[in-house]
Amino acid sequence: MNGRVDYLVTEEEINLTRGPSGLGFNIVGGTDQQYVSNDSGIYVSRIKENGAAALDGRLQEGDKILSVNGQDLKNLLHQDAVDLFRNAGYAVSLRVQHRLQVQNGPIGHRGEGDPSG
Protein backbone atom coordinates (compact mmCIF):
# COMPACT_ATOMS: atom_id res chain seq x y z
CA MET A 1 0.00 0.00 0.00
CA ASN A 2 1.41 3.36 -1.01
CA GLY A 3 1.27 6.39 1.26
CA ARG A 4 -0.44 9.62 0.26
CA VAL A 5 1.78 12.44 -0.94
CA ASP A 6 0.97 15.79 0.67
CA TYR A 7 2.63 19.16 0.25
CA LEU A 8 3.55 21.70 2.86
CA VAL A 9 3.41 25.15 1.26
CA THR A 10 5.20 28.08 2.86
CA GLU A 11 6.00 31.60 1.67
CA GLU A 12 9.17 33.56 2.25
CA GLU A 13 10.59 36.95 1.37
CA ILE A 14 14.14 36.58 0.05
CA ASN A 15 16.35 39.61 -0.43
CA LEU A 16 19.21 39.01 -2.84
CA THR A 17 22.09 41.25 -3.76
CA ARG A 18 23.01 40.93 -7.41
CA GLY A 19 26.49 39.42 -7.73
CA PRO A 20 29.20 39.92 -10.37
CA SER A 21 27.47 37.38 -12.63
CA GLY A 22 23.94 38.37 -11.67
CA LEU A 23 21.34 36.62 -9.53
CA GLY A 24 22.42 33.11 -10.45
CA PHE A 25 19.32 31.12 -11.33
CA ASN A 26 17.12 29.97 -14.21
CA ILE A 27 13.36 30.13 -14.50
CA VAL A 28 10.61 28.30 -16.36
CA GLY A 29 6.96 29.18 -16.78
CA GLY A 30 4.79 31.97 -18.08
CA THR A 31 1.51 32.16 -19.97
CA ASP A 32 3.26 30.92 -23.13
CA GLN A 33 5.37 28.25 -21.35
CA GLN A 34 3.29 26.42 -18.79
CA TYR A 35 5.73 24.24 -16.88
CA VAL A 36 3.16 23.05 -14.36
CA SER A 37 -0.27 21.92 -15.60
CA ASN A 38 -2.90 24.66 -15.33
CA ASP A 39 -0.39 27.06 -13.79
CA SER A 40 1.34 29.82 -15.74
CA GLY A 41 3.43 30.82 -12.72
CA ILE A 42 7.20 31.32 -12.72
CA TYR A 43 9.33 28.58 -11.16
CA VAL A 44 13.03 28.25 -10.34
CA SER A 45 14.52 25.52 -12.53
CA ARG A 46 18.22 25.85 -11.76
CA ILE A 47 20.45 27.45 -9.14
CA LYS A 48 23.89 28.38 -10.43
CA GLU A 49 26.74 27.10 -8.29
CA ASN A 50 28.45 29.94 -6.41
CA GLY A 51 25.95 32.46 -7.75
CA ALA A 52 24.14 35.02 -5.60
CA ALA A 53 21.11 32.77 -4.98
CA ALA A 54 23.26 29.74 -4.13
CA LEU A 55 25.42 31.72 -1.72
CA ASP A 56 22.31 33.09 0.00
CA GLY A 57 21.00 29.53 0.27
CA ARG A 58 17.27 30.10 0.65
CA LEU A 59 16.00 29.92 -2.94
CA GLN A 60 15.55 26.33 -4.11
CA GLU A 61 14.86 24.59 -7.41
CA GLY A 62 11.11 24.13 -7.68
CA ASP A 63 10.24 27.30 -5.77
CA LYS A 64 7.49 29.41 -7.29
CA ILE A 65 8.35 33.11 -7.51
CA LEU A 66 5.27 35.17 -6.74
CA SER A 67 6.71 38.66 -7.04
CA VAL A 68 9.89 40.62 -7.76
CA ASN A 69 10.38 43.89 -5.89
CA GLY A 70 6.66 43.85 -5.13
CA GLN A 71 5.64 43.31 -8.74
CA ASP A 72 3.31 40.35 -9.23
CA LEU A 73 4.46 37.68 -11.69
CA LYS A 74 0.95 36.51 -12.61
CA ASN A 75 -0.04 36.34 -16.27
CA LEU A 76 3.35 37.22 -17.72
CA LEU A 77 4.90 35.90 -20.90
CA HIS A 78 8.06 33.91 -20.19
CA GLN A 79 10.42 36.46 -21.73
CA ASP A 80 8.69 39.33 -19.93
CA ALA A 81 9.36 37.54 -16.65
CA VAL A 82 13.01 37.05 -17.59
CA ASP A 83 13.30 40.75 -18.44
CA LEU A 84 11.73 41.69 -15.12
CA PHE A 85 14.53 39.90 -13.25
CA ARG A 86 17.20 41.39 -15.50
CA ASN A 87 15.94 44.90 -14.85
CA ALA A 88 15.27 44.42 -11.14
CA GLY A 89 18.31 46.37 -9.98
CA TYR A 90 21.07 45.62 -7.49
CA ALA A 91 18.95 44.71 -4.47
CA VAL A 92 16.22 42.28 -5.43
CA SER A 93 13.34 41.24 -3.21
CA LEU A 94 11.65 37.94 -4.12
CA ARG A 95 8.43 36.64 -2.63
CA VAL A 96 8.64 32.88 -3.07
CA GLN A 97 6.51 29.86 -2.38
CA HIS A 98 8.31 26.74 -1.19
CA ARG A 99 6.50 23.45 -1.73
CA LEU A 100 7.85 20.67 0.45
CA GLN A 101 6.74 17.14 -0.33
CA VAL A 102 5.58 15.23 2.72
CA GLN A 103 5.20 11.48 2.40
CA ASN A 104 2.48 10.08 4.62
CA GLY A 105 3.32 6.37 4.67
CA PRO A 106 1.14 3.53 5.95
CA ILE A 107 0.85 3.34 9.74
CA GLY A 108 3.83 1.58 11.26
CA HIS A 109 6.06 2.20 8.23
CA ARG A 110 9.32 4.01 8.85
CA GLY A 111 11.00 5.72 5.93
CA GLU A 112 14.63 5.12 5.00
CA GLY A 113 15.74 8.50 6.24
CA ASP A 114 13.86 8.40 9.53
CA PRO A 115 16.32 9.55 12.21
CA SER A 116 14.59 7.40 14.86
CA GLY A 117 15.76 4.25 13.02
Epitope: S21, N26, V28, Q33, Y35, K48, H78, Q79
Partner: nanobody
Framework: EVQLVESGGGLVQAGGSLRLSCAAS????????LGWFRQAPGKEREFVGT??????STADSVKGRFTISRDNAKNTVYLQMNSLKPEDTAVYYC?????????????????????WGQGTQVTVS
Protein backbone atom coordinates in the same frame (compact mmCIF):
# COMPACT_ATOMS: atom_id res chain seq x y z
CA GLU B 1 17.80 13.39 -15.61
CA VAL B 2 18.33 14.87 -19.08
CA GLN B 3 20.26 12.75 -21.58
CA LEU B 4 21.84 14.20 -24.73
CA VAL B 5 23.07 12.25 -27.75
CA GLU B 6 24.95 13.98 -30.57
CA SER B 7 25.27 12.65 -34.11
CA GLY B 8 26.26 13.85 -37.57
CA GLY B 9 30.00 14.32 -37.16
CA GLY B 10 32.55 13.07 -39.63
CA LEU B 11 35.31 13.94 -42.06
CA VAL B 12 34.64 16.75 -44.51
CA GLN B 13 36.73 18.81 -46.93
CA ALA B 14 37.37 22.50 -46.30
CA GLY B 15 34.49 24.55 -47.65
CA GLY B 16 32.03 21.72 -47.07
CA SER B 17 29.03 21.44 -44.77
CA LEU B 18 27.81 19.22 -41.96
CA ARG B 19 24.70 19.21 -39.81
CA LEU B 20 25.05 17.99 -36.26
CA SER B 21 22.03 16.81 -34.30
CA CYS B 22 21.51 16.49 -30.58
CA ALA B 23 18.58 14.42 -29.35
CA ALA B 24 17.44 15.09 -25.80
CA SER B 25 15.24 13.29 -23.33
CA UNK B 26 12.65 15.02 -21.18
CA UNK B 27 9.05 16.16 -21.49
CA UNK B 28 9.91 19.85 -21.04
CA UNK B 29 12.43 20.09 -23.90
CA UNK B 30 10.92 23.35 -25.17
CA UNK B 31 12.03 25.08 -21.96
CA UNK B 32 15.69 24.01 -22.26
CA UNK B 33 18.52 26.38 -23.02
CA LEU B 34 20.71 24.38 -25.41
CA GLY B 35 24.32 25.12 -26.22
CA TRP B 36 26.95 23.82 -28.60
CA PHE B 37 30.59 23.77 -27.53
CA ARG B 38 33.70 22.36 -29.12
CA GLN B 39 37.09 21.20 -27.95
CA ALA B 40 40.14 20.82 -30.15
CA PRO B 41 43.10 18.70 -28.97
CA GLY B 42 45.13 20.55 -26.34
CA LYS B 43 42.67 23.44 -26.19
CA GLU B 44 39.95 24.53 -23.78
CA ARG B 45 36.29 23.91 -24.46
CA GLU B 46 35.00 26.75 -26.62
CA PHE B 47 31.49 28.17 -26.92
CA VAL B 48 29.98 27.78 -30.39
CA GLY B 49 26.43 28.97 -29.88
CA THR B 50 23.19 28.60 -27.98
CA UNK B 51 19.46 28.59 -28.50
CA UNK B 52 16.98 29.68 -25.84
CA UNK B 53 13.25 30.26 -25.59
CA UNK B 54 13.67 33.68 -27.17
CA UNK B 55 16.27 33.14 -29.89
CA UNK B 56 19.73 31.95 -30.83
CA SER B 57 23.26 33.31 -31.02
CA THR B 58 26.63 32.07 -32.27
CA ALA B 59 30.21 32.92 -31.35
CA ASP B 60 32.02 35.50 -33.46
CA SER B 61 34.40 32.82 -34.77
CA VAL B 62 31.54 30.99 -36.52
CA LYS B 63 29.05 33.80 -37.14
CA GLY B 64 27.67 33.74 -40.66
CA ARG B 65 28.80 30.14 -41.15
CA PHE B 66 27.07 28.21 -38.35
CA THR B 67 23.40 28.37 -37.38
CA ILE B 68 21.50 26.73 -34.53
CA SER B 69 17.91 25.58 -34.72
CA ARG B 70 15.62 23.32 -32.74
CA ASP B 71 12.62 21.08 -33.33
CA ASN B 72 10.63 20.88 -30.11
CA ALA B 73 8.38 18.16 -31.53
CA LYS B 74 11.43 15.95 -32.04
CA ASN B 75 13.29 17.00 -28.88
CA THR B 76 16.27 17.82 -31.10
CA VAL B 77 18.64 20.74 -31.57
CA TYR B 78 20.75 21.18 -34.70
CA LEU B 79 24.03 22.84 -35.59
CA GLN B 80 24.27 23.60 -39.30
CA MET B 81 27.92 24.16 -40.21
CA ASN B 82 28.76 25.67 -43.60
CA SER B 83 32.03 26.89 -45.17
CA LEU B 84 33.97 24.66 -42.80
CA LYS B 85 37.65 25.40 -42.15
CA PRO B 86 40.46 23.17 -40.84
CA GLU B 87 40.39 25.18 -37.60
CA ASP B 88 36.82 23.97 -37.02
CA THR B 89 38.23 20.49 -36.37
CA ALA B 90 37.19 19.46 -32.85
CA VAL B 91 34.91 17.29 -30.79
CA TYR B 92 31.51 19.03 -30.71
CA TYR B 93 29.39 18.80 -27.57
CA CYS B 94 25.74 19.55 -26.96
CA UNK B 95 24.81 20.94 -23.53
CA UNK B 96 21.54 21.76 -21.81
CA UNK B 97 20.16 23.68 -18.87
CA UNK B 98 16.53 23.71 -17.84
CA UNK B 99 14.91 27.10 -18.16
CA UNK B 100 16.16 30.55 -19.03
CA UNK B 101 18.96 32.32 -17.21
CA UNK B 102 17.78 35.51 -15.55
CA UNK B 103 21.30 36.88 -16.04
CA UNK B 104 22.31 36.19 -19.63
CA UNK B 105 20.45 36.17 -22.95
CA UNK B 106 22.77 33.59 -24.46
CA UNK B 107 24.84 31.77 -21.81
CA UNK B 108 28.33 31.04 -23.12
CA UNK B 109 29.97 29.75 -19.94
CA UNK B 110 30.07 25.93 -19.69
CA UNK B 111 29.18 26.31 -16.01
CA UNK B 112 25.75 27.59 -17.07
CA UNK B 113 24.92 24.10 -18.35
CA UNK B 114 24.17 21.00 -16.30
CA UNK B 115 23.84 18.25 -18.88
CA TRP B 116 26.32 17.23 -21.57
CA GLY B 117 26.42 14.80 -24.46
CA GLN B 118 29.34 12.48 -25.17
CA GLY B 119 30.49 14.54 -28.17
CA THR B 120 30.86 13.93 -31.90
CA GLN B 121 34.11 14.33 -33.84
CA VAL B 122 34.28 16.78 -36.73
CA THR B 123 37.42 16.74 -38.87
CA VAL B 124 37.95 19.28 -41.66
CA SER B 125 40.79 18.44 -44.05
Amino acid sequence: EVQLVESGGGLVQAGGSLRLSCAASGRTFSTYTLGWFRQAPGKEREFVGTITWSGSSTADSVKGRFTISRDNAKNTVYLQMNSLKPEDTAVYYCAAAIGSSVDSDYPSDPLEYDYWGQGTQVTVS
